[in-house]
């Protein structure tokens, strides 16, 4: 396995022609982003138009757990997804055109590892091939970023504040504001993977409320202001 090479080309002999698979040695991406795992292949079955299955697995070739699988009916260029782990994997390539490239959405650090593509011809040309070396996906950590901060109406004419941040490792969120002691208790809930949301359930005073997100790579801040027209029937921000 020439892991230093930009491309791994794997092949075995077949009568007159060859199976081969081309995958990059490595793909790098940041947590929270998407990554494309390229995989193209050649095969000895010229003009094969029968049913086929495209598979991606993680961990180890041949035996690792499948993260994606789709099947294409005879003559069809549509590969119908049968499995997409957590709904984050989708085929970018067209297996009929020898392309099994896969897109992985909403990357987390735990997605780091080796991925292996496989194609199975399941018609008259009963044959299959799988990448032995695979492509290594390296997901790098991401500094915190506040993606949303807002004040919303709450019960009994009160207001609440929401702060959503993303980062990997997931950042810790803290609210600070004009309340005595300059900080307020926040309800923090785990969001989707790399996203975290914290709620300040009751804004008792006017002023500036600041959400701080921090992880091992850094910190981010964003503020929201609350001003109420006291005595007026319609309170506003």
């Amino acid at each position: 396995d020439a892991s230093g090479d930009l491309l791994n080309t794997e092949a075995h002999s077949a009568p007159a022609q060859r199976w081969s698979m081309q995958v990059p040695a490595e793909v790098n991406a940041e947590a929270g982003d998407a990554a494309v795992l390229p995989c193209t292949f050649t095969h000895p079955h010229r003009h094969y138009d029968g049913p086929l299955t495209a598979i991606w697995r993680s961990g180890e070739p041949y035996a690792g757990p499948q993260v994606f699988r789709c099947t294409a009916a005879p003559g069809s260029e549509l590969c119908q997804t049968a499995l997409s782990l957590h709904g984050r994997f989708r085929l970018l390539g067209n297996p009929r055109r020898n392309d099994l490239s896969l897109r992985v959405e909403r990357l987390a650090l735990a997605d780091s590892g080796r991925y292996f593509c496989r194609v199975e011809f399941t018609g008259d040309a009963h044959d299959r091939y799988e990448s032995r070396h695979g492509v290594r996906l390296r997901v790098t950590a991401a500094a915190p970023r506040i993606v949303n901060i807002s004040v919303l109406p709450g019960p009994a004419h009160a207001f609440r504040a929401l702060c959503t941040a993303e980062g990997e490792p997931p950042p810790a969120l803290a609210w600070s504001g004009p309340a005595p002691g300059n900080s307020s208790a926040a309800l923090q809930g785990q969001g989707h993977g790399y996203q975290v949301t914290a709620e300040l359930p009751a804004l008792t005073r006017d002023g500036r409320y600041t959400c701080t997100a921090a992880n091992s790579l850094g910190r981010a801040e964003a503020s929201v202001y609350l001003f109420r027209f006291h005595g007026a029937p319609g309170t506003s921000t």
Partner: antibody, heavy 122, light 107 residues
Framework: EVQLLESGGGLVQPGGSLRLSCAAS????????MSWVRQAPGKGLEWVST????????YYADSVKGRFTISRDNSKNTLYLQMNSLRAEDTAVYYC???????????????WGQGTMVTVSS | DIQMTQSPSSVSASVGDRVTITCRAS??????LAWYQQKPGKAPKLLIY???YIHSGVPSRFSGSGSGTDFTLTISSLQPEDFATYYC?????????FGQGTKLEIK
């Protein structure tokens, strides 16, 4: 626990029928091709039949073609082998086996049941 | 059908010995070969798949090699629990076929 448990074996007269079952647990049954492999007393292993993960395709050894039928119920995580027109040479321990890593191909059999004995004798 | 021929059919060895079992296919099967171990009254256990990949939980003293038509299973240092019958099996094409088996006995 990941396991396969066969049942349904027994003594049957030549020309008779039996239905073997294999209950799977501990893995996503529908994602894997499943097979039956048999072993006559004191002999080696013989592949009998394979069915794909979704049941789309079935394959048989020539020695059982037309007499045996493999099927699966993915809602019950169970594999079956219906054996008709049984002959003395079908006497064997029958194992169900799971394919490694694929719903269509059996690159290898990575999980085996304990086996169930089928004896065809008058 | 693809014929699989194992040799030897039986072998006697001692604990600590290095043992090699060979399997020959009647036609090119690429790397689609598996090795199994079977003990009396028990189901077979997968040792090696796709010619050279060691199945999880299998001791590293077992190794497989080869491609095309000639394959080898090697046990680098025999342990008492290794005395059993070993089978090769091709998964290149249906019907899947097994070798006749190699019985590994204590010398």
């Amino acid at each position: 626990e990941v396991q396969l448990l066969e049942s349904g074996g027994g003594l049957v007269q030549p020309g008779g029928s039996l239905r073997l079952s294999c209950a799977a647990s501990g893995f996503t049954f529908s994602s894997y091709a499943m097979s039956w492999v048999r072993q006559a007393p004191g002999k080696g292993l013989e592949w009998v039949s394979t069915i794909t993960g979704g049941g789309e395709s079935t394959y048989y050894a020539d020695s059982v073609k037309g007499r045996f039928t493999i099927s699966r119920d993915n809602s019950k995580n169970t594999l079956y082998l219906q054996m008709n027109s049984l002959r003395a040479e079908d006497t064997a321990v029958y194992y169900c086996a799971k394919a490694i890593g694929s719903s269509w191909y059996s690159d290898a059999f990575d999980l085996w049941g304990q086996g169930t004995m089928v004896t065809v004798s008058s | 059908d693809i014929q699989m021929t194992q040799s030897p059919s039986s072998v006697s060895a001692s604990v600590g010995d290095r043992v090699t079992i060979t399997c020959r296919a009647s036609q090119d099967i690429s790397s689609w070969l598996a090795w199994y171990q079977q003990k009396p009254g028990k189901a077979p256990k997968l040792l090696i798949y796709v010619a050279s990949y060691i199945h999880s939980g299998v001791p590293s003293r077992f190794s497989g090699s080869g491609s095309g038509t000639d394959f080898t299973l090697t046990i680098s240092s025999l342990q008492p629990e290794d005395f059993a019958t070993y089978y090769c099996q091709q998964s290149y094409s249906i019907p899947y076929t097994f070798g006749q088996g190699t019985k590994l006995e204590i010398k």
